[in-house]
């Protein structure tokens, strides 16, 4: 009778074991062990017992002791079970961001590990077990579905293997995968609200505001504002579940035309976008052109108004005929036209909006000098010793210089209050002089003496 000890062994992969083969007869013809494993016999006294060291045991094996005794041949097997923890325990890669309300499938792959009968795979959220299954197949795969909730944000999911060798007198060997940190988010189906000017003039600044409610977690939302290829740099203000992004936009002549204004909100692996068109226009004020800004009385003057090719102008309230970007009027300059304003108003339609621009020019008419009866009476009669103010107003543009002299030397104090004396009496020659020429007028002062009364 052949016996083996131990009859059952559990050992780590690559490990060694001592196996004793014994026989019940004293003088066996043969006693040995049959195994593909490297073996080393340990020398013992007697010939009915042999001890072998079996080394580098990589997989389950059943070495067989055999003996040949006078009463026949017999065998006995020992069962070597190799244990080893899994090589890799991994959660299948997932996007770190998951939308709330979506079903998330967690898949754990376990490579290797033995004995499989003692190997269990556990899927966890934090320390909470979601699923526990025996490891089957290579790789062993365990999956579970999780309905993503808002309160799962930041939760760690992991996969753990348990090689439970406690029934065999060993321990519980655990391997855990790298955790997968779930980041949940809510991005509403409604696009962001975009408030901006519909039209914007070249070389001016406008303000753009993009906002959205119902986001979670709002602090993780990325906002991208752009006008055409120009990225805007907004100032973002966050609420509990909302944000408002405000940016200044400057446009130049290069941007002229219809541009796309976009506001994109990116949260997790999703985005919402709002597009709006902004028309960038160039509309200089109309040009008022006078033949000459300063003309002499009687000169023919042309007043022209020129504006943007697509504008419609009115000149001094009179629309261009035909309606268009140009208007003009002709006049013969009179003194009354001096200081007259010529106002041109231009209207341009940009993206359905009417834009108005004005420009005004003043005409200067050179005339005179002029001395007439109304403003410079030819006869004054004043009582002697009375207080009087001689008045003589010369007209013209430029304003003439006025001098009234008696006998070429004695001046009449124009505009000054004087006491009338006999000396004041006489005929004065009033001379008004300007760059436009000169005029003269005789003014006679009569003084009434009391004795004549």
């Amino acid at each position: 009778q052949t016996s083996v000890s131990p009859s059952k062994v559990i050992l780590p992969r690559g490990g060694s074991v001592l196996v004793t083969c014994s026989t019940s007869c004293d003088q066996p013809k043969l006693l040995g062990i049959e195994t593909p494993l490297p073996k080393k016999e340990l020398l013992l006294p007697g010939n009915n017992r042999k001890v072998y060291e079996l080394s580098n045991v990589q997989e389950d094996s059943q070495p067989m002791c055999y003996s040949n005794c006078p009463d026949g041949q017999s065998t006995a097997k020992t069962f070597l079970t190799v244990y080893w923890t899994p090589e890799r325990v991994e959660l299948a890669p997932l996007p770190s961001w998951q939308p709330v309300g979506k079903n998330l499938t967690l898949r754990c792959q376990v490579e290797g590990g033995a004995p499989r009968a003692n190997l269990t795979v556990v899927l966890l959220r934090g320390e909470k077990e979601l699923k526990r299954e025996p490891a089957v197949g290579e790789p062993a795969e365990v999956t579970t579905t999780v309905l993503v909730r808002r309160d799962h944000h930041g939760a760690n999911f992991s996969c753990r293997t348990e090689l439970d060798l406690r029934p065999q007198g060993l321990e519980l060997f655990e391997n855990t995968s790298a955790p997968y940190q779930l980041q949940t988010f809510v991005l509403p189906a409604t696009p962001p609200q975009l408030v901006s000017p519909r039209v914007l003039e070249v070389d001016t600044q406008g303000t753009v505001v993009c906002s959205l409610d119902g986001l979670f977690p709002v602090s993780e939302a990325q906002v991208h504002l752009a006008l055409g290829d120009q990225r805007l740099n907004p100032t973002v203000t966050y609420g509990n579940d909302s944000f408002s992004a405000k940016a200044s936009v400057s446009v130049t002549a290069e941007d002229e035309g219809t541009q796309r204004l976009t506001c994109a909100v990116i949260l997790g692996n999703q985005s919402q976008e709002t597009l709006q068109t902004v028309t960038i226009y160039s509309f200089p004020a109309p040009n008022v052109i006078l033949t000459k800004p300063e003309v002499s009385e009687g000169t023919e003057v042309t007043v022209k108004c020129e504006a943007h090719p697509r504008a419609k102008v009115t000149l001094n309230g009179v629309p261009a005929q035909p309606l268009g970007p140009r208007a003009q009027l002709l006049l013969k300059a009179t003194p009354e036209d001096n200081g007259r304003s010529f106002s041109c108003s231009a209207t341009l339609e940009v993206a359905g909006q009417l834009i108005h621009k004005n420009q005004t020019r003043e005409l200067r008419v050179l005339y005179g000098p002029r001395l007439d009866e109304r403003d410079c009476p030819g006869n004054w009669t004043w009582p002697e010793n009375s207080q009087q103010t001689p008045m003589c107003q010369a007209w013209g543009n430029p304003l003439p210089e006025l001098k009234c002299l008696k006998d070429g030397t004695f001046p009449l104090p124009i505009g000054e209050s004087v006491t009338v004396t006999r000396d004041l009496e006489g005929t004065y020659l009033c001379r008004a002089r300007s760059t436009q020429g000169e005029v003269t007028r005789k003014v006679t002062v009569n003084v009434l003496s009391p004795r004549y009364e």
Epitope: E87, E138, P139
Partner: antibody, heavy 120, light 112 residues
Framework: QVQLQQSGAEVKKPGASVKISCKAS????????LHWVRQAPGQRLEWIGV????????KYSQKFQGKVTITRDTSASTAYLELSSLRSEDTAIHYC?????????????WGQGTALTVSS | DVVLTQTPLSSPVTLGQPASISCRSS???????????LHWYLQRAGQPPRLLIY???NRFSGVPDRFSGSGAGTDFTLKISRVEAEDVGVYFC?????????FGGGTKLEIK
């Protein structure tokens, strides 16, 4: 004892397809994955892909994606490597090898190899 | 892809003498779980490769203890303490840390 028996040598014309088999014995077929490796003349060994004999899931080297298809028949304990649109560069010895799915403990048992010659 | 460079390309050795083969990786072969999946194979003429060492230093079953593996990170070595006639062939290192899995170019061991 563990054995992987591969189908015989193949000679194919460019543009044709070929399907090589690898029959496993001496162990529980679904306990191990099967990998395919090729050795072209004068070239180093190249890993082609792997199949989980249990689930049928496959993983391929980017180089061979679209070129090869690995399948298995659990009832016959056999894995297959199919190569399509053959070119002369596909001339090589193709080996199947037993291992864990990610090959972490090495390829412990290999088939004898199937020589594929692609020539017009 | 990870490139494994073996040196020498060829190694003539006297029977009974030691032999050493080096394998250098273009990047670390330490996996995120701390294990290093570097293996060694021997391919004799007309035969498929045969696993000798797995995970840097673990001898596969049936592999004589004259074979040993060592190394870490990017540098690995296969040593044969006393070369025997049956050790002749091409030795390959291989990595299963990074996808796709790759092999070294091989080192031919021959008897002087």
């Amino acid at each position: 004892q563990v054995q992987l028996q591969q189908s015989g040598a193949e000679v194919k014309k460019p543009g044709a397809s070929v399907k090589i088999s690898c029959k496993a014995s001496g162990y529980t077929f679904t306990d191990y994955a099967l990998h395919w490796v090729r050795q072209a003349p004068g070239q180093r060994l190249e890993w082609i892909g792997v199949i989980s004999t249990y689930s049928g899931n496959t993983k391929y080297s980017q180089k061979f994606q679209g070129k090869v298809t690995i399948t298995r028949d659990t009832s016959a304990s056999t894995a297959y490597l199919e190569l399509s649109s053959l070119r002369s560069e596909d001339t090589a010895i193709h080996y199947c090898a037993r291992s864990l799915y990610f090959g972490s403990s090495g390829f412990d048992y290999w088939g004898q190899g199937t020589a594929l010659t692609v020539s017009s | 892809d990870v490139v494994l460079t073996q040196t020498p390309l060829s190694s003539p050795v006297t029977l009974g003498q030691p032999a050493s083969i080096s394998c250098r990786s273009s990047q670390t072969l330490v996996y995120r779980n701390g294990n290093t999946y570097l293996h060694w194979y021997l391919q004799r003429a007309g035969q498929p490769p045969r696993l000798l060492i797995y995970k840097v230093s673990n001898r596969f079953s049936g592999v004589p203890d004259r074979f040993s593996g060592s190394g870490a990170g990017t540098d690995f070595t296969l040593k044969i303490s006393r070369v025997e006639a049956e050790d002749v062939g091409v030795y390959f290192c291989s990595q299963n840390t990074h996808f796709p899995y790759t092999f070294g170019g091989g080192t031919k061991l021959e008897i002087k």
